[in-house]
């Protein structure tokens, strides 16, 4: 079944964590429907973004952050694993120094801390895609 | 009550038609939430695009038009007469020589035909909305 | 082993221009940002400027904002630093650094001294 | 004026605790790392992401940060631990600031 988009969760994050994304876009890649990910470091969708993880299917994909409600310098890629019409699975996992992004499996992009991963707060996924998983898996320590 | 989006509805316009939308950003204008209509020549989402209408909400919007499966010479606005947070109603009415487009009442652009109003055969209203008024009116002969 | 070696130091005049160097090797010089923090004498470090590891992006601290010009080439394994329109407050030992994955100054170069006087 | 604020001078006796301070950043955004100066030489890096050691830095070396505030503490201060100690973080991500810095004499 279908989870609400925009879809919101409060989380925890650290050295360790996963956040795994399962959907589908709503639109042909020819139409450029996006897909976001915003991790926030409060529940109120205005508050600053850790890591802001933004595809533009079939394009390209951009990641940055958002300080004291600025953003900051963007990382573009034209990498694009990401199937017209298809399914994909992200995974976002933290490691000590970056956010590594794969994309069905494969790892497809990083993005170096900013701001620690500790900060976050909440995630949101949202934009032109149907979500069916959504799980943040912890380290068990 | 909501109507599902992407919204897609078959329409066949000409001179005297409008089409008019109601509905709601899904996000504040920080996170800049997107509104999309575009009037199509086929029922298909992959068809050309006779206006290409596109609100980045406080920041833009882009008008366009999609001939042969290309983007050709995009026009921009920083008009801006949407408000973070509020319902609007938009209106595309079919004049002559262009369509015209009042926001909550308030002519704010215009776009010059390229392709025939009659070529279009369906509409398509999507992106970071919910929608509550989907309608085209046509003149009486 | 990180080797970081600045060049190009000197005496110049108040209002003058000097272009200091830093050769790289023991690393994948274009895998890494790099930056300039300079230290002048008997004072604290600053950061001066950084660069990304393609050198598109540049930043820039707000006290040689629209003066000084980082600049990299990957192919020769060199950081580069244009200082314009100097000031006797630029004057300072300037060091080479490898920024390391949290955005911290991994290695050091020896330094080399600017000193901007009439 | 830095926006990092460090004791100017602090002094330890041979083998024991030395906590350097460092106030007025925004560390439960920004990692902090600190840097150890001897006279005549360039920095050395001992602490990088609030608490991680890189290699070749002693154990006795650690660091924390809480709120306000991050420490670098020397369990143990040895008499070749005498020297400048800079803390650095940030103002935002792409602007890098360090603290005035902190003169540690081992006694």
């Known amino acids: 079944s279908l989870l609400p988009v925009p879809y919101t969760e409060a989380a925890s994050l650290s050295t360790g964590s996963t956040v795994t994304i399962k959907g589908r876009p709503l639109a042909c890649f020819l139409n450029e429907p996006y897909l976001q990910v915003d991790f926030h470091t409060e529940m109120k969708e205005e508050s600053d973004i850790v890591f802001h993880f933004q595809v533009c299917f079939g394009r390209r994909v951009v990641m940055n952050s958002r300080e004291y409600g600025a953003w900051k310098q963007q990382v573009e890629s034209k990498n694009m694993p990401f199937q017209d019409g298809q399914e994909f699975e992200l995974s976002i996992s933290v490691l000590p120094d970056k956010y590594q992004v794969m994309v069905n499996g494969q790892s497809s992009y990083t993005f170096d801390h900013r701001i620690k991963p500790e900060a976050v707060k909440m995630v949101q996924v949202w934009r032109d895609i149907s979500l069916t998983k959504f799980n943040v898996s912890y380290l068990k320590r | 009550s909501l109507l599902p989006v992407p919204y897609t509805e078959a329409a066949s316009l000409s001179t005297g038609s409008t089409v008019t939308i109601k509905g709601r950003p899904l996000a504040c204008f920080l996170n800049e939430p997107y509104l999309q209509v575009d009037f199509h020549t086929e029922m298909k989402e992959e068809s050309d695009i006779v206006f290409h209408f596109q609100v980045c909400f406080g920041r833009r919007v882009v008008m366009n038009s999609r001939e042969y499966g290309a983007w050709k010479q995009q026009v921009e606005s920083k008009n801006m007469p949407f408000q973070d947070g509020q319902e609007f109603e938009l209106s595309i009415s079919v004049l002559p020589d262009k369509y015209q487009v009042m926001v909550n009442g308030q002519s704010s652009y215009t776009f010059d035909h390229r392709i025939k109003p009659e070529a279009v055969k369906m509409v398509q209203v999507w992106r970071d909305i919910s929608l509550t008024k989907f309608n085209v009116s046509y003149l009486k002969r | 082993q990180v080797q970081l070696v600045e060049s190009g130091g000197g005496l110049v005049q108040p209002g003058g221009s000097l272009r200091v160097s830093c050769a790289a090797s023991g690393f994948t010089f274009s895998s890494y940002y790099m930056s300039w923090v300079r230290q002048a004498p008997g004072k604290g470090l600053e950061w001066v400027s950084a660069i990304n590891s393609g050198g598109g992006s540049t930043y820039y601290a707000d006290s040689v904002k629209g003066r000084f010009t980082i600049s990299r080439d990957n192919a020769k394994n060199t950081l580069y630093l244009q200082m314009n329109s100097l000031k006797s407050e630029d004057t300072a030992v300037y060091y080479c650094?490898?920024?390391?994955?949290?955005?911290?100054?991994?290695?050091w170069g020896q330094g080399t001294q600017v000193t901007v006087s009439s | 004026s830095s926006a990092l604020t460090q004791p100017s001078a602090i002094s330890v006796s041979l083998g024991q605790t030395a906590r350097i301070t460092c106030q007025g950043g925004n560390f439960g955004y920004y990692y902090v790392s600190w840097y150890q100066q001897k006279p005549g030489q360039a920095p050395v890096q001992v602490i990088y992401g609030d608490s991680n050691r890189p290699s070749g830095i002693p154990e006795r070396f650690s660091g924390s940060s809480s709120g306000g505030t991050a420490t670098l503490t020397i369990s143990g201060a040895q008499a070749e631990d005498e020297a400048d100690y800079y803390c650095?973080?940030?103002?935002?991500?792409?602007?890098?600031?360090f603290g005035g810095g902190t003169h540690l004499t081992v006694l």
């Open positions: 650094v490898q920024n390391g994955g949290i955005w911290s100054f991994g290695s």
């Open positions: 650095l973080s940030y103002e935002s991500s792409d602007y890098p600031v």
